[in-house]
């Protein structure tokens, strides 16, 4: 129960995680424009990673794209990169992983084969994390090192009296947004990878040997546990616990609707 | 048509407060923004601030904070403006104009002036 | 605050003639983000309100003869007027669209010769 549920919880905090890595690469506000220390402006400029965009005090929003490509910083282009990356591969990870859910049955698909499924979707979620936080940081250190270089030259003189004010920007929504989709996403490729590890099925030294007694039908099973009668006895290596309880596979045939989230 | 109907003239002694109105048509009143702008007898246009009345966000040139009060009424699209403690430097013209949309906050409708004399 | 610099402060005119004003901010009324300058051009006649002209430094208000045009960038515009009419006897006045407070230019006034 605790490795569906924590596969699970992986797969949706995953979900979130690149829901919101995909919500903050087409969000327009990566840097916004600082307003502290700085004339009061009528304009508010903020910029995304595909446009960049003006709101004027009327509520009037003009947008323009970004028309060109070689035009455009090496970092603007890698940060598009990384985001793009960390989508395609959470995107990947997220339909590798449905079919890795425990609650959910694909023909005979066999415990093995849905714990490697889980690992790789785990490992993939991680990646597309990094990914994330990767991007978002190179933007942000970007805009850092601009802020600073602006700072230091924020007025330049023109002719003595006429000054030109530099737009310096700042961290925007979009920055906190894929910094905080970045972890989920790496978080919920953490717990896949650990429910990765319960899904595997444990192997044990010993093969299950039948002693046939006459006259009865018991099947004995070296290793300390608990003899399970009949001659149609599972034959898979499952451990069989005390008290006669079988193991989750065997007794939940169809999945509940407490695996659904 | 867009109007913006501004109230009568005023006569006010030093000291005293006055309220005028800009009432306007023609248009979504919350939709735009309304600035008020003075204007003293043979000199030039002084902004005094806007009030945005879709949701009564305010901006005040500091020189008129304190002086003046914008507010707007939805329910009858009418904006207003209070000046206190009037001095003989408050007669003056006083505009209401509608910002347009779109238009770099140009200023493209524009009332007929409320005209405030301060005498004693 | 901006400072707006009218000049000249008064024209004296003859109908059909082509006027050139101009006006001066103390900063820079191009934004850098969409590359546009914010400035207005407005008219006033007596005992009227002003009247809007141009807007982002060149784009004719509708309803303004193409007689009126706006140009210029930065810190520096011009409004031109290419064949003066009595009816466009006024004071003309530029204001910063950009930056709060906004301001308005001290106006020159165009007169009949």
């Known amino acids: 129960m605790a490795v569906t549920a924590c596969q699970g919880l992986g797969f949706v905090v995953s979900l979130i995680g690149i829901a919101g890595i995909i919500a903050a690469t087409c969000m327009d506000q990566w840097s916004t424009q600082d307003l502290y220390n700085n004339p009061v402006t009528a304009v508010f400029n903020y910029q995304g990673l595909w446009r960049s965009c003006v709101r004027e005090s009327s509520g009037f929003t003009e947008c323009r794209g970004y028309f060109t490509l070689l035009g455009l910083p090496a970092m603007l282009q890698a940060v598009r990169a990384l985001m793009i990356v960390g989508i395609v591969l959470g995107a990947i990870g997220l339909l590798v992983s449905i079919f890795a859910l425990k609650c959910i049955r694909i023909g005979s698909m066999e415990d093995s084969a849905k714990a490697n499924m889980t690992l790789t979707s785990g490992i993939m979620f991680i990646v597309s994390g990094l990914c994330a936080i990767a991007g978002v940081s190179v933007f942000a250190n970007m805009l850092v090192t601009n802020f600073w270089m602006s700072t230091a030259n924020m007025y330049t003189g023109m002719g003595g009296m006429v000054q030109t004010v530099q737009t310096r920007y700042t961290f925007g929504a979009a920055l906190f947004v894929g910094w905080v989709a970045g972890g989920l996403t790496l978080i919920g490729g953490v717990m896949m990878c650990i429910a990765c590890r319960g899904l595997a099925p444990e192997e044990t030294n010993y093969k299950a040997v039948s002693y046939h007694a006459s006259g009865h039908s018991v099947a004995y099973k070296p290793g300390g546990f608990k003899a399970s009668t009949g001659f149609g006895s599972n034959t898979k290596n499952k451990k069989i616990y005390d008290g006669g309880a079988r193991t989750e596979d065997e007794v939940q045939s169809y999945p509940s609707k407490h695996d659904y989230v | 048509e867009v109007q913006l109907q501004q109230s009568g003239p005023e006569l006010v002694k030093p000291g005293a407060s006055v309220k005028m109105s800009c009432k306007a048509s023609?248009?979504?009143?919350?939709?735009?923004?309304i600035h008020w702008v003075k204007q003293k007898p043979g000199q030039g246009l002084e902004w005094i601030g806007y009030i945005n009345p879709y949701n009564d966000g305010s901006k005040y040139n500091e020189k008129f904070k304190g002086k003046a009060t914008l507010t707007s009424d939805k329910s009858s699209s009418t904006a207003y403006m209070e000046l206190s403690s009037l001095t003989s430097e408050d007669s003056a013209v006083y505009y209401c104009?509608?910002?347009?949309?779109?238009?770099?906050?140009?200023?493209?409708?524009w009332g007929q002036g409320t005209s405030v004399t301060v005498s004693s | 605050d901006i400072v707006m610099t009218q000049s000249p402060s008064s024209l004296s005119v003859s109908a059909g003639e082509r006027v050139t004003m101009s006006c001066k901010s103390s900063q820079s009324l191009l934004n850098s983000g969409n590359q546009k300058n914010y400035l207005a051009w407005y008219q006033q006649k007596p005992g009227q309100p002003p009247k809007l002209l141009i807007y982002g430094a060149s784009t004719r208000e509708s309803g303004v003869p193409d007689r009126f045009t706006g140009s210029g960038s930065g810190t520096d515009f011009t409004l031109i007027i290419s064949s003066v009419q009595v009816e466009d006897l006024a004071v003309y006045y530029c204001?910063?669209?950009?930056?709060?407070?906004?301001?308005f230019g001290a106006g020159t006034k165009l007169e009949l010769k």
């Open positions: 023609g248009y979504t009143f919350t939709s735009y923004v």
């Open positions: 204001q910063n669209d950009h930056f709060y407070p906004l301001t």
């Open positions: 104009a509608r910002e347009g949309y779109g238009k770099r906050n140009a200023l493209d409708y």
